[in-house]
Amino acid sequence: EPPTACREKQYLINSQCCSLCQPGQKLVSDCTEFTETECLPCSESEFLDTWNRETRCHQHKYCDPNLGLQVQQKGTSETDTICTCEEGLHCTSESCESCVPHRSCLPGFGVKQIATGVSDTICEPCPVGFFSNVSSAFEKCRPWTSCETKDLVVQQAGTNKTDVVCGPQDRQR
């Protein structure tokens, strides 16, 4: 009796089960009662990443330098090209179709996580005892200066944007 369902890596056509083409190959002709499925390898600029019955391979992604993209991993007949962003830029989406400059953390905020080619800078507010007086994509919040260790006293309290100002202790006679 003709099958109604097929095994894994097979497909049903003309009341019979045919083998799917393996990753990296496209379908040329369906199987028959006498011949196996005919598949052909994808060309150098193309790929198919699953067991399939596609008659055309997919084009490898183009990492457009005009969009700040560069090749992270060259595509094969079974995998797509992986793009990443040039230095100082990161992807705008998971599929990394374009890049934007990393953001800087404003004064009062420090870098919690430095940006990569695929993720933006993560900033965090400087907690009490720490400050950042620059706009930077690299600098963390720095601790206030410890006046005591320098045998000095705090003359001006620090904020999240400014360091404490130390001064000499008043000498009592």
Epitope: V28, T32, E33, F34, T35, E36
Partner: antibody
Framework: EVQLVESGGGLVKPGGSLRLSCAAS????????ISWVRQAPGKGLEWVAS????????YYPDNVKGRFTISRDNAKNSLYLQMNSLRAEDTAVYYC??????????WGQGTLVTVSS | EIVLTQSPATLSLSPGERATLSCRAS??????LHWYQQKPGQAPRLLIK???QSISGIPARFSGSGSGTDFTLTISSLEPEDFAVYFC?????????FGGGTKVEIK
């Protein structure tokens, strides 16, 4: 027991016609594709024609296309090969063979076709 | 058309010896290859399917291997009834084609 029995072979003049038959028994004929394969005297095997289980698809190599026609009658468990415009190089033993899992798993004993003037 | 080349054309061996028959395809055919045995005056008989799968009723001394373009039929220890002609056949694409055959004869 699976059996395939060919008949209809004989001596025919170049340009002539012949119709071969293959009678099947011992299996559900309508569930299997069948092929004709020939063997010239002292030579190797050569595929001649194939027909799908339902008879809706037929396949031929270029050297017989347009001259040979494969057909079947599932009600009679019979396979046929109509051969026209016969040539000396068509001289061979003709076998019918069942297609099981894309292999020719059962063969008939063959029938000899001789094309000669 | 896929051309199958069998070698050697003739193999002269004694009973009990190991026979190694080769079949080479002109292009890759994965494992889409069968082996047949033919004795004089008889129809061919299926020995091995899909390059390496055994057939019910065929003695275990017959085995097949290979994939892509190079295939081998091995008879581990020749019996007197194994002296015959062996053909490979591809079913990867139309037209179906057979190799020219290897004759295994008694030395």
């Amino acid at each position: 027991e699976v059996q395939l029995v060919e008949s209809g072979g004989g001596l025919v003049k170049p340009g002539g016609s012949l119709r071969l038959s293959c009678a099947a028994s011992g299996f559900t004929f309508s569930n299997y594709g069948i092929s004709w394969v020939r063997q010239a005297p002292g030579k190797g095997l050569e595929w001649v024609a194939s027909i799908s289980s339902g008879g809706d698809n037929t396949y031929y190599p270029d050297n017989v296309k347009g001259r040979f026609t494969i057909s079947r009658d599932n009600a009679k468990n019979s396979l046929y090969l109509q051969m026209n415009s016969l040539r000396a190089e068509d001289t061979a033993v003709y076998y019918c063979a069942r297609a099981g899992e894309k292999a020719m798993d059962y063969w008939g004993q063959g029938t000899l076709v001789t094309v000669s003037s | 058309e896929i051309v199958l080349t069998q070698s050697p054309a003739t193999l002269s061996l004694s009973p009990g010896e190991r026979a190694t028959l080769s079949c080479r395809a002109s292009q890759t055919i994965n494992n889409n290859l069968h082996w047949y045995q033919q004795k004089p005056g008889q129809a061919p008989r299926l020995l091995i399917k899909y390059a390496s799968q055994s057939i019910s009723g065929i003695p275990a001394r017959f085995s097949g291997s290979g994939s892509g373009t190079d295939f081998t039929l091995t008879i581990s220890s020749l019996e007197p009834e194994d002296f015959a002609v062996y053909f490979c056949q591809q079913f990867s694409s139309w037209p179906l084609t057979f190799g020219g055959g290897t004759k295994v004869e008694i030395k």
